[in-house]
């Protein structure tokens, strides 16, 4: 059993998130993460999950009766959705804390608005390498 | 020229995005889209970089001078990330939506933990077609 | 400060096996990712092991096939690496390296710092 | 493979600049982050340049690193060059199965 399940029940039992009434009025990511099948499809929502999680036990962090869960969670997060590779998960901490009130970050993130909309789309990205047009090909049918 | 290439200029013209200190201190978005190339990665980081757009438009819906600008892109994200697949969209802004300081979204959460984590590595998805079978292969010694 | 003291080490005839220790003070070892490298006489740097720290991933060089195994007792603050069906080749000075907080909570930089080895050398 | 590629050896005099470079093989450069360490004779290996472009506290900022993404290289400069310099350099990073690769290290002579 990998080691997360133990810590997501030490989890439950700190949230009282085992009790029965908690189910009511459907589930708030399962039954997206059902809908969607194509790993880039999954990706996008997956992301925003993750960063929900991160915000959740950043807001906990400081609290000793489950520190070492939420650390174990982190790094099985980190495994899982990052594979591991601490650039990836350090970008994506970037992006997750600018924040969106500051003048500064709106102004260059207007600047930017061109050539991320620009590369948005997955046909968007020119002179890529043959492995990226051999996947674009693969899932042109799906 | 994509319509929202004439709407972003007039956003750069309201937040003055377009003076030459914006660039100052390396960017926001794009030198972290230039780490990622692999369409599964790509889409990670664009989640988040689309819901801080979206969170930023969302501050000033209100404001006559850039509705139309704000609603053409919000539109073109539509058509280019979300494929103009309105569930796609919807499911998006259902997870963005969700309050971390909430504590029945917080129960919900941790109550959903073990499943959201077992599905977060391609390798966890069970029934996919051979392509996933192959990732599992190469990642069979971890 | 932080320390990583490496041993067990020696010789060993081919088709022996050995188990080497790396002894860590100085930070909190139960948070950090874990590596072994090694290097031949005369020869560059090796990879060979690493291992999470709190969710017990293990990562192997494709070279050794499966003749190795990395554990931790995060209680004694210890890194070990079960060598068997050693050969000549696995001659090396093996190193024990600290890598990064894998949670993310005080990430740390990965290889930052090294014990001073311990050599095993694989003789008939 | 994954290999990163670095030149055998480079030599030059005291007060010059070099450059090693370490191209990857497969994967992008870009995606993973790029380590260097110096290792002189007997020693043992000590990081001179961290997550691509940074310096940990103590190496002298004659000490730089970068990443060229048209090449699909890391490179580490050294100005300035010293005699203290004359040392192995390896690069290191990772794969997509989160192995650690090492470059075949560089030998940095100081000329005399």
């Known amino acids: 059993q990998d080691p997360y399940v133990k810590e997501a029940e030490n989890l439950k039992k700190y949230f009282n998130a085992g009790d029965p009434d908690v189910a009511d009025n459907g589930t708030l990511f399962l039954d997206i993460l059902r809908n969607w099948k194509e790993e880039s499809d999954r990706k996008i929502m997956q992301s925003q999950i993750v960063s929900f999680y991160f915000k959740l036990f950043k807001n906990f962090k400081d609290d000793q009766r489950i520190q070492k869960s939420v650390e174990t969670i982190k790094e099985d997060i980190n495994v899982k959705f990052f594979n591991s590779n601490k650039k990836k998960r350090d970008d994506f901490e970037k992006l997750t804390n600018y924040s969106v009130t500051d003048s500064n970050v709106q102004r260059k993130a207007v600047h930017e608005l061109i050539q991320v909309m620009a590369e948005l789309s997955p046909a968007a990205k020119i002179g890529k390498r043959k492995r990226s047009q051999m996947f674009r090909g693969r899932r042109a049918s799906q | 020229q994509d319509p929202y290439v004439k709407e972003a200029e007039n956003l750069k013209k309201y937040f003055n995005a377009g003076d030459p200190d914006v660039a100052d201190n390396g960017t926001l978005f794009l030198d972290i889209l230039r780490n990622w190339k692999e369409e599964s990665d790509r889409k990670i980081m664009q989640s988040q970089i689309v819901s801080f757009y979206f969170k930023l438009f969302k501050n000033f819906k209100d404001d006559q001078r850039i509705q139309k600008s704000v609603e053409t892109i919000k539109e073109d994200i539509n058509v280019k990330f979300f494929n103009s697949n309105k569930k796609k969209r919807d499911d998006f802004e259902k997870l963005t939506n969700y309050s971390v300081t909430d504590s029945n979204v917080q129960r919900k959460a941790v109550h959903e933990l073990i499943q959201v984590m077992a599905e977060l590595s391609p390798a966890a998805k069970i029934g996919k077609r051979k392509r996933s079978q192959m990732f599992r292969g190469r990642r069979a010694s971890q | 400060e932080v320390q990583l003291v490496e041993s067990g080490g020696g010789l060993v005839k081919p088709g022996g096996s050995l188990r080497l220790s790396c002894a860590a003070s100085?930070?909190?070892?139960?948070?950090?990712?874990m590596h072994w490298v090694r290097q031949a006489p005369g020869k560059g740097l090796e990879w060979v092991s690493s291992?999470?720290?709190?969710?017990?991933?293990?990562y192997y060089a494709d070279s050794l096939k499966g003749r190795f195994l990395i554990s931790r007792d995060n209680d004694r603050d210890s890194l070990y690496l079960e060598m068997n069906s050693l050969g000549v080749e696995d001659t090396a000075i093996y190193f024990c390296?600290?890598?990064?907080?894998?949670?993310?909570?005080?990430?740390?930089?990965?290889?930052?710092?090294w014990g001073q080895g311990t050599l095993v050398t694989v003789s008939s | 493979n994954f290999m990163l590629t670095q030149p055998h050896s480079v030599s030059e005099s005291p007060g010059k600049t070099i450059t090693i470079s370490c191209t990857r093989g497969?994967?992008?450069?870009?995606?993973?982050?790029v380590q260097w360490y110096q290792q002189r004779p007997g020693g043992v290996p000590k990081i001179v340049v961290f997550?691509?472009?940074?310096?940990p506290s103590g190496v002298p900022d004659r000490i730089s690193g970068s990443i060229d993404t048209s090449t699909n290289s890391a490179s580490l400069t050294i100005s300035g060059l010293q005699t203290e310099d004359e040392a192995d350099y390896y690069c290191?990073?990772?794969?997509?199965?989160?192995?650690?690769?090492f470059g075949g290290g560089t030998k940095l002579t100081v000329l005399g």
């Open positions: 390296a600290r890598g990064y907080d894998t949670s993310g909570s005080d990430s740390g930089v990965d290889f930052q710092y």
């Open positions: 100085g930070f909190p070892f139960s948070r950090y990712s």
């Open positions: 291992m999470t720290s709190r969710t017990n991933h293990k």
């Open positions: 497969r994967g992008y450069i870009a995606s993973y982050y």
């Open positions: 997550e691509d472009t940074q310096r």
């Open positions: 290191q990073s990772y794969d997509d199965a989160n192995h650690v690769i």
